[in-house]
């Protein structure tokens, strides 16, 4: 899977879309790793 | 509004450096990479680097590395780019750019900054 | 590096008309691909990440396909504020790398 910044950002912008925002306040994309998904 | 504001245009001598700051507003800046790009008159664009304002970890064209650093200074939501031993070729307009998720998703780019260098 | 090549390089057409810019990649890329417009004198704008996904704001009349190494952008209908250079840029490997543009001209 592709863990540049760019990639680790849209992925979290889906996950996040997909939970409705209910993550924990530090998942950001400067705070998680390509492992974190 | 999320808003990406550089520093003014900079004529510089050749073999000399120049600092560029892109200050950030409108969201959290520790939360987001910023990137640098490089766009020579008439010519395409060119990915620089990134850094991690959460941690100051970088990304580097293996073009550019040795000549730029890029840093951050958190109190102040502010990123810079340094580029040393600067040449002719070096003439060019520098972007930041970053891509947030919250207030809003998008792909925010600077104004631009344009370097000149010349003797 | 990755190299973007995008065809034509040039195109005319008017306003109203249907176009479509491509955009290889020298690799797959998988679906790591955004597409920006940019006027003179201007910064980049976000049009399309992820190949196919439109950022807010942007118009439905933009539409992005593609996986690869083979990418696709197409206005369905030219408006005139749509006459600019239009430049793919690939994020799946370091150093990010972007095509040379295709500048989108009023016949």
């Known amino acids: 899977a592709c863990d540049t910044a760019t990639c680790v950002t849209h992925r979290l912008a889906g996950l996040l879309s997909r939970s409705g925002g209910v993550v924990k306040n530090n998942f950001v994309p400067t705070n998680v790793g390509s492992k974190a998904f | 509004q999320v808003q990406l504001v550089q520093s003014g245009a900079e004529v510089v001598k050749p073999g000399a450096s120049v600092k560029v700051s892109c200050k950030a507003s409108g969201y959290t800046f520790t939360d987001y990479y910023m990137n640098w790009v490089k766009q020579a008159p008439g010519q395409g664009l060119e990915w620089i680097g990134d850094?991690?304002?959460?941690?100051?970890?970088?990304h580097y064209n293996q073009k550019f590395k040795g000549r730029v650093t890029l840093t951050v200074d958190t109190s102040i939501s502010t990123a810079y780019m340094e580029l040393s031993r600067l040449r002719s070729d070096d003439t060019a307009v520098y972007y930041c750019?970053?891509?947030?998720?919250?207030?809003?998703?998008?792909?925010?780019w600077g104004q631009g900054t344009l370097v000149t260098v010349s003797s | 590096d990755i190299q973007l090549t995008q065809s034509p390089s040039f195109l005319s057409a008017s306003v109203g008309d249907r176009v479509t810019i491509t955009c290889k990649a020298s690799q797959n890329v998988g679906p790591n691909v955004a597409w920006y417009r940019q006027k003179p004198g201007k910064a980049p704008k976000a049009l399309i990440y992820?190949?196919?996904y439109r950022y807010s704001g942007v118009p439905s009349r933009f539409s992005g396909s593609g996986s690869g190494t083979e990418f696709t952008l197409t206005i369905s209908s030219l408006q005139p504020e749509d006459f600019a250079t239009y430049i793919c840029q690939q994020y799946n490997y370091y150093p990010y790398t972007f095509g040379q543009g295709t500048k989108l001209e009023i016949k």
């Open positions: 850094v991690n304002p959460n941690n100051g970890g970088t």
């Open positions: 750019a970053s891509i947030t998720i919250v207030p809003v998703y998008f792909d925010f």
């Open positions: 992820s190949a196919s």
